[in-house]
């Protein structure tokens, strides 16, 4: 999906209003310095691409974040403010339901969500130059 046509200001407002708090809740008990940010993004469409990938694609050691509250809200925000996003996700959602596993918060998942927090922070500051 090409995130170029999303309403970035609305997605930012949704993040600041509620998604950010759910990410903090998920990470509660973890020191903010515990994980290094290794994933970056260069502009808002790129940030949303990376956010979608880290949130919804299973990775080694973290089978699924998709049922977490922050993930459900992220999916909803993209569906509302990215035209056509919902239609592209129907097949992906059906595939995800088939391989759904019970929720387990592993250290790898905490690291992944820490990366997500960094991507969201970068998304909210689009005019900053890359380090």
């Amino acid at each position: 999906y090409d995130f170029t046509n999303c309403d970035f200001e609305k997605i930012k407002a949704a993040y600041l209003s509620t998604i950010s708090k759910d990410l903090i809740t998920y990470m509660s008990g973890t020191k903010s310095t515990e994980f290094n940010n290794t994933v970056s993004c260069s502009n808002r469409p790129h940030c949303l691409t990376e956010i979608q990938s880290l949130t919804f694609n299973p990775t080694a050691g973290c089978a699924s974040l998709a049922k977490e509250m922050f993930a459900m809200k992220t999916k909803a925000a993209l569906a509302i403010w990215c035209p056509g996003y919902s239609e592209t996700q129907i097949n992906a959602t059906q595939a995800m339901k088939k391989r759904r596993k019970r929720k387990v918060t592993t250290n790898k998942c905490l690291e992944q969500v820490s990366q997500l927090q960094g991507l969201w922070r970068r998304f909210n500051r689009p005019l900053l130059k890359q380090q």
Epitope: K10, A13, A76, I80
Partner: nanobody, 132 residues
Framework: EVQLLESGGGLVQPGGSLRLSCAAS????????ITWFRQAPGKGREGVAY????????YYADSVKGRFTISSDNSKNTVYLQMNSLRAEDTAVYYC?????????????????????????WGQGTLVTVSS
């Protein structure tokens, strides 16, 4: 030019009823979500009730569930808030606000409807005072 015009506020006794109206113009009413917010003195804006003019889906704040009813008349481009069993704590300025994408994505909007930062257009507000 987009306009939202609230009316129907006033002074009412505890236990009484009021019906607020929000008349809209200047945008495609049938695609929009309209939400009633309220702001009591010294407090932030609180989402009260949401309606999608696209499919009629509604959401309510827990504090007003069973007492307030939101409805829409697309032929008149107007949204109503029927307020029954009013309490002193319902005293506030009531605003209607419109958003252009949450109307056609009402199920996904369950997470976001009550956050004022997401709305494009606002009315000027109408004061509701509940007092004996």
């Amino acid at each position: 030019e987009v306009q939202l015009l609230e009316s129907g506020g006033g002074l009412v006794q505890p236990g009484g009823s009021l019906r607020l109206s929000c008349a809209a113009s200047g945008f495609t009413f049938g695609d929009y979500a309209i939400t009633w917010f309220r702001q009591a003195p010294g407090k932030g804006r609180e989402g009260v009730a949401y309606i999608s003019n696209f499919d009629g889906m509604t959401y309510y704040a827990d504090s007003v569930k069973g007492r307030f009813t939101i409805s829409s008349d697309n032929s008149k481009n107007t949204v109503y808030l029927q307020m029954n069993s009013l309490r002193a704590e319902d005293t506030a300025v009531y605003y209607c606000a419109a958003e252009g994408r949450m109307g056609t994505h009402s199920r996904d909007s369950v997470y976001f409807w009550a956050f004022s930062a997401l709305y494009d257009y606002w009315g000027q507000g109408t004061l509701v005072t509940v007092s004996s």
